[in-house]
């Protein structure tokens, strides 16, 4: 027999199939040109000393073979003695070590058996009613196909599935979608209606994330407020990476989980923009305000679960950075200015009424005045900070007020509103004899003492009514008692107390008269 022809004789070996697990498999035969054909197969097992024979039986019952030696691929023409227009049955017999192993048979019409291509190019992936939908352009001149898919997870082996018949310029497949694990898919095609024809190669991997992106396991901490009024938000724990199937472990697109940070600045609600979204890798600097920080995970199917963290406001206060002057027209605040064209946000809230919303005011962009100060004024009619109570004031600054991450804290302090001079006057001043020439003066704490850092000192004034001589005694703001000594018996005195702030002298309390009785010896 000639090597280019199918030999219509008995093959040169015994015909028994050993039935072993090794041997030839996955035989596929197809037309490769107008008159050329190709068959190829896989061989499982040791290849040394193996000879392969491609067997063919015609519809008439006559059979022939091609001897291919150790090759697992054979090309032949339509002149090789094999009928290409009628149905034939083909299989491979592999002979080795006096044993013959046989592949499964394929029955087909060779002329109609075209080598189909797998889905090529861009395979679009979407979610449809809890399932995965894949869609691709049908390869040129190959409309009419049967399509199969195989899929695996990081912990499972390949499972085969059927996409059903396709008959259009675009083909699609519905596949199972896993809730919590990534999957790798591959697709293959063959000619529709030719059961014996061969499958295409498997497509490139299609990597699909789980339906639910993983919960972002992160932890935040925040550094101390720096001298620039900003503090760094830091990530203490990175999000866990998704486990991927074998074919998706390179730079395979499609399975990525992206994490984003959504910042919400809770303080200063009158500013232009309260929220900002940025990538998780870009950890921002924050002002001393309170923030909510959400970590949002998303994949190709959209957003997944998120985590929300709360960053409390930095409560560190500077006692004297703010100067407040009250005039007949209204009140003006002064503080050390930032750069040119800075917008300030001034926020205040009554202390002890934290349940109420803070009052917020935004200034127009302003430059420092000649003394290097920034200012904010309001009229008496506005009623702002008009009540005689303690207010917590915070001032924020930004040269770019629409950029949430560029705000900084200028100062955080306390202020006693209204007529602090009168409201702060100490009450319940009482005088008790202490010794023959001294008395103890006590008073109730000033309302100013409820306002941290506002009360600078008490001053106790004692006037000798005989000589009109006056002495003043400064007292620490934490004390509400002083001893007056070197007093003379039988002389009338008056005592008054006032409470002073750093920028305001208080009003004297009502005069309290007393005298030390003259001791009469028996």
């Amino acid at each position: 027999c000639r090597t280019s022809e199918c030999c219509f004789q008995d093959p040169p070996y015994s015909d028994a199939d050993s039935g072993s697990a090794s041997g030839p498999r996955d035989l596929s035969c197809y037309r490769i040109s107008s008159a050329g054909y190709e068959c190829s197969w896989q061989y499982e097992g040791p290849t040394a000393g193996v000879s392969h024979f491609l067997r063919c039986c015609l519809s008439s019952g006559r059979c022939c073979y091609f001897a291919t030696g150790s090759a697992t691929r054979l090309q032949f023409s339509d002149q090789a003695g094999v009928s290409v227009l009628h149905t034939v049955t083909l299989w491979v017999e592999s002979w080795a070590r006096n044993r013959t192993e046989k592949s499964p048979e394929v029955t087909l019409q060779l002329y109609k058996s075209v080598k189909y291509k797998p889905p090529l190019g861009d395979i679009k992936v979407s979610k449809l009613a809890g399932q995965l939908r894949m869609e691709w352009e049908t390869p040129d001149n190959q409309v009419g196909a049967e399509v199969q898919f195989r899929h695996r997870t990081p912990s499972s082996s390949w499972k085969l599935g059927d996409c059903g018949p396709q008959d259009d310029d675009t083909e699609s497949c519905l596949c199972p979608l896993e809730m919590n694990v990534a999957q790798e898919f591959q697709l293959r095609r063959r000619r529709l209606g030719s059961q014996g024809s061969s499958w295409s190669k498997w497509s490139s991997p299609v990597c699909v994330p789980p339906e639910n992106p993983p919960q972002p396991q992160v932890r935040f901490s925040v550094e101390q407020l720096g001298r620039d009024g900003r503090r760094r938000l830091t990530l203490k724990e990175q999000p866990t990476q998704l486990e991927l199937p074998e074919g998706c472990q390179g730079p395979a697109p499609g399975v990525e989980v992206t994490y984003q940070l959504q910042l919400h600045m809770l303080s200063c609600p009158c500013k232009a923009k309260a929220t900002r979204t940025l990538p998780l890798e870009k950890m921002p600097y924050l002002s001393g305000a309170a923030y909510n920080v959400a970590v949002i995970s998303s994949n190709r199917f959209g957003p997944g679960p998120n985590q929300t963290w709360h960053i409390p406001a930095d409560t560190h206060t500077e006692p004297v950075a703010l100067n407040i002057s009250v005039g007949t027209n209204g009140t003006t605040m002064y503080w050390p200015a930032r750069a040119q064209s800075t917008t300030y946000c001034i926020e205040w809230q009554p202390v002890g009424q934290e349940g109420s919303l803070a009052t917020c005011n935004l200034t127009a962009p302003q430059d420092p005045d000649p003394a290097g100060m920034a200012t904010y004024s309001w009229s008496r009619e506005s009623g702002a900070m008009g009540q005689e109570k303690c207010y917590h004031i915070t001032i924020f600054a930004s040269a770019h007020p629409k950029k949430l991450t560029l705000w900084s804290t200028v100062l955080s302090t306390y202020h006693f509103g209204g007529n602090a001079s009168a409201a702060g006057t100490p009450h319940h001043v009482s005088v008790k004899n202490h010794s023959l020439d001294s008395v103890s003066v006590d008073w109730a704490p000033s309302l100013l003492s409820t306002c941290p850092g506002v009360l600078k000192e008490y001053v106790v004034r004692c006037r000798d009514e005989d000589s009109n001589q006056v002495s003043e005694h400064p007292v620490q703001p934490t004390e509400t008692q002083v001893t007056l000594s070197d007093l003379r018996a039988g002389v009338a005195y008056t005592v008054q107390v006032r409470a002073d702030t750093a920028w305001l002298r208080g009003a004297w309390s009502q005069p309290q008269r007393f005298s030390i009785k003259v001791q009469v010896s028996d």
Epitope: V222, L266, W309, I311, P312, A313, Q349, G355, L357, A358
Partner: nanobody, 126 residues
């Protein structure tokens, strides 16, 4: 110590409304924030709403946003959860939780909170 007592749970028809309350007593001056969580039979505990005691800023998950509203009355030391357009999947035991102190914490995690109530049961029938 802080004690939290929930009330106001009950049976309601789908589409209906209910308001549950949580009264706090004890060292309530230390309260920084309050939250509601819920647990349906056989499911994990789920975050429902969060409110800052100062200023009243609120946070909700997507599942209840627009239907539920958390509010508080500082004078009464009480936090409320107003639930509208109720669905059968809202059926659960609702717990309130209190946060003391001013550290960074996760709003939607049960473990972030310092004190918890015993819960009040809400059943939504279809």
């Amino acid at each position: 110590e802080v004690q939290l007592v929930e009330s106001g749970g009950g049976l309601v028809q789908a589409g209906g409304s209910l308001r549950v309350a949580c009264a706090a007593s004890g060292r309530t001056f230390s309260t920084y924030a309050m939250a509601w969580f819920r647990q349906a039979p056989g499911k994990e505990r789920e975050f429902v709403a969060h409110i800052l005691w100062s200023g009243g800023s609120t946070v909700y998950p997507d599942s209840v946003r627009g239907r539920f509203t958390i509010s508080r009355d500082n004078a009464k030391n009480t936090v409320y959860l107003q639930m509208n357009s109720l669905k059968p999947e809202d059926t659960a035991v609702y717990y309130c939780a209190q946060k003391s102190g001013r550290q960074v914490y996760r709003i939607d995690s049960w473990d972030s909170f310092d004190y918890w109530g015993q819960g009040t049961s809400v059943t939504v029938s279809s």
